[in-house]
């Protein structure tokens, strides 16, 4: 799934070289991109007699007229003059149409069309502009994730896009959290998906000339509950010098709320284990996963007494997991000496 939005201008549609005045109806919020002449030697664009700068929201650049998002004040007469002469290559009037970002998705898409519209380039049925962005057809997504479906398209007149779920008009009104329809991105975004979001999502792209559709298949996976998972190799066996500070790290993964304890194995009456077979331990730190830095055990200014076995114990409503590591503390005067520590223990 694509993580980021990106501005996507309409494909550059080259107006014909007919010099009679032509009209083009543009929906509010719609990006405009028109060509005039060849890219490098393209003509200069003028609006109401003033030449458009190569930068800004409305710009004339390399023969292109580009409007990032059409506003009412952008309506008017636009001329494209050939470089180095006063030859009119393009003479058109942009007229304000209905808003593309209207929240009323029940509108008949045909209502965006002006039957008297005289377009400056041939009519064209909708087509996919970036089919490679639509190749991922089957989506299996863990519950809680965000899903984004895109159907970038173009055509003339500019097509409208509608979304269906399992063949029915889909506006997201019955969906907790709703949906985001980004018409300029031809996208549908659903945050925090749940099992009821499963199904077939169809984008239906239409204009006066024709229509195209594409299906995305969405499955929402519910993770089966499990006891906490501890990252392999953590906590790690550590060797430190007397007086130094030590950090032991434990990485815990758990869907259900986990509870974490740091334990130090101790010896009582010369024995490490009680009559019940469980080791003697001292609880050093206890908290839930939301506590800051609960997954790190800090040992300050360690002494020889701090040497030994440490265990990270994590539990949730399903069960317990633990992993252990050994801390070896070296005397300051002989830092080259190392003791062989047992391997860290891992649960199954």
């Amino acid at each position: 799934l694509e993580a980021s939005e990106e501005v996507e201008l309409e494909p550059c549609l080259a107006p014909s070289l007919e010099q009679q005045e032509q009209e083009l109806t543009v929906a509010l919020g719609q990006p405009v991109r028109l060509c005039c002449g060849r890219a490098e030697r393209g003509g200069h664009w003028y609006k109401e007699g003033s030449r458009l700068a190569p930068a800004g929201r409305v710009r004339g650049w390399r023969g292109r007229l580009e409007i990032a998002s059409f506003l009412p004040e952008d309506a008017g007469r636009y001329l494209c003059l050939a470089r180095g002469s006063m030859i009119v290559l393009q003479n058109l009037t942009l007229i304000t149409g209905d808003s593309l970002t209207s929240s009323n998705d029940d509108e008949d898409p045909k209502s965006h069309r002006d039957p008297s519209n005289r377009h400056s380039y041939p009519q064209q049925a909708p087509y996919w502009t970036h089919p490679q962005r639509m190749e991922k057809k089957l989506h299996a997504v863990p519950a809680g994730n965000t899903v984004k479906f895109r159907c970038p398209a173009a055509g003339n007149p500019t097509p409208t896009i509608r979304w269906l779920k399992d063949g029915q008009a889909f506006h997201g009104e019955n969906r907790i959290g709703g949906i985001r329809l980004r018409h300029q991105h031809w996208s549908l975004v659903m945050e925090s998906v749940v099992p009821s979001d499963r199904g077939t999502y169809t984008c239906l792209v239409e204009n006066a000339v024709g229509s195209i559709r594409y299906n995305y298949l969405l499955d929402v996976l519910e993770r089966s509950p499990h006891r906490p998972i501890l990252q392999a190799g953590l906590p790690a066996n550590t060797t430190a010098v007397v007086g130094s500070d030590v950090e032991l790290l434990c990485k815990v993964y758990s869907d259900a709320q986990p509870h974490i304890q740091w334990l130090k194995h101790i010896v009582i009456n010369g024995s490490s284990f009680g009559a019940d077979g469980f080791p003697y331990v001292q609880v050093l730190k206890t908290a839930d996963i939301n506590s800051s830095e609960v997954e790190v055990l800090y040992l300050r200014n360690v002494s020889a007494e701090d040497a030994g076995e440490y265990t990270c114990l994590a539990g949730n409503s399903i069960g317990l997991s633990y992993q252990s590591a050994w801390l070896t503390v070296l005397p300051e005067e002989d830092p080259t000496w190392t003791a062989a520590a047992p391997e860290a223990r891992y649960t199954d």
């Epitope: 190749e135 057809k137 089957l138 299996a140 099992p195 077939t200 169809t202 299906n215 929402v220």
Partner: antibody, heavy 118, light 112 residues
Framework: EVQLLESGGGLVQPGGSLRLSCAAS????????MSWVRQAPGKGLEWVSA????????YYADSVKGRFTISRDNSKNTLYLQMNSLRAEDTAVYYC???????????WGQGTLVTVSS | QSVLTQPPSASGTPGQRVTISCSGS????????VHWYQQLPGTAPKLLIY???RRPSGVPDRFSGSKSGTSASLAISGLRSEDEADYYC?????????????FGGGTKLTVL
């Protein structure tokens, strides 16, 4: 290694029923869309049905809609195809296959033969 | 009658290059990627090309795929006797009745 093993095929009379099974191993079964594809003797491949990993969404070819039901038991890593009101034209080798994210049938079983005849 | 159209047969001599076509419509090949399968005699189909032109690991680079508009093709260069098999194209179809998978009728390739 992905393994798919179909079973349950056999001879059945027109109008009868049969249930095919596909035992899967070597991958996280519940994460994958699965499908059934059939091939009549001496003919080409025909898609029959597909199901999402959770089992929440099912898809059918028009030729079997209303007669066949696809299902799965993720706890048993098994895919099923319940075939009712069988017709002679349903005679085929039935393959189960994994469906990859981008649409292709990635892995196929060896197939099980279903013969519908009186 | 298959939704995707393939020639029923194709042939070539060892070392030759052979191309198999597959034509469809805007609702299938026009909107979706094309996948190719090879079925050797008496065996289950095997994925040969996916997403128009990608080869799964283990498939020799003698096999290549392409797509343009509503048509696709599979090319086999340096033909070998072991390439004699049935070849099928397939794609999802986004028809009005909902998503389904469509196959070509298959092309029987004979290595002369």
């Amino acid at each position: 290694e992905v393994q798919l093993l179909e079973s349950g095929g056999g001879l059945v009379q027109p109008g009868g029923s049969l249930r095919l099974s596909c035992a899967a191993s070597g991958f996280t079964f519940s994460d994958y869309y699965m499908s059934w594809v059939r091939q009549a003797p001496g003919k080409g491949l025909e898609w029959v049905s597909a199901i999402s990993g959770s089992g929440g969404s099912t898809y059918y070819a028009d030729s079997v809609k209303g007669r066949f039901t696809i299902s799965r038991d993720n706890s048993k890593n098994t895919l099923y195809l319940q075939m009712n009101s069988l017709r002679a034209e349903d005679t085929a080798v039935y393959y189960c296959a994994t469906l990859a994210t981008y649409g292709p049938f990635d892995d196929w079983g060896q197939g099980t033969l279903v013969t519908v005849s009186s | 009658q298959s939704v995707l159209t393939q020639p029923p047969s194709a042939s070539g001599t060892p070392g030759q290059r052979v191309t198999i076509s597959c034509s469809g419509s805007s609702s299938n090949i026009g909107s979706n990627t094309v996948h190719w399968y090879q079925q050797l005699p008496g065996t289950a189909p095997k994925l040969l090309i996916y997403r128009n032109n990608r080869r799964p690991s283990g498939v020799p680079d003698r096999f290549s795929g392409s797509k343009s508009g509503t048509s696709a093709s599979l090319a086999i260069s340096g033909l070998r006797s072991e390439d004699e098999a049935d070849y099928y194209c397939a794609a999802w179809d986004d028809s009005l009745s909902g998503p389904n998978v469509v196959f070509g009728g298959g092309t029987k390739l004979t290595v002369l």
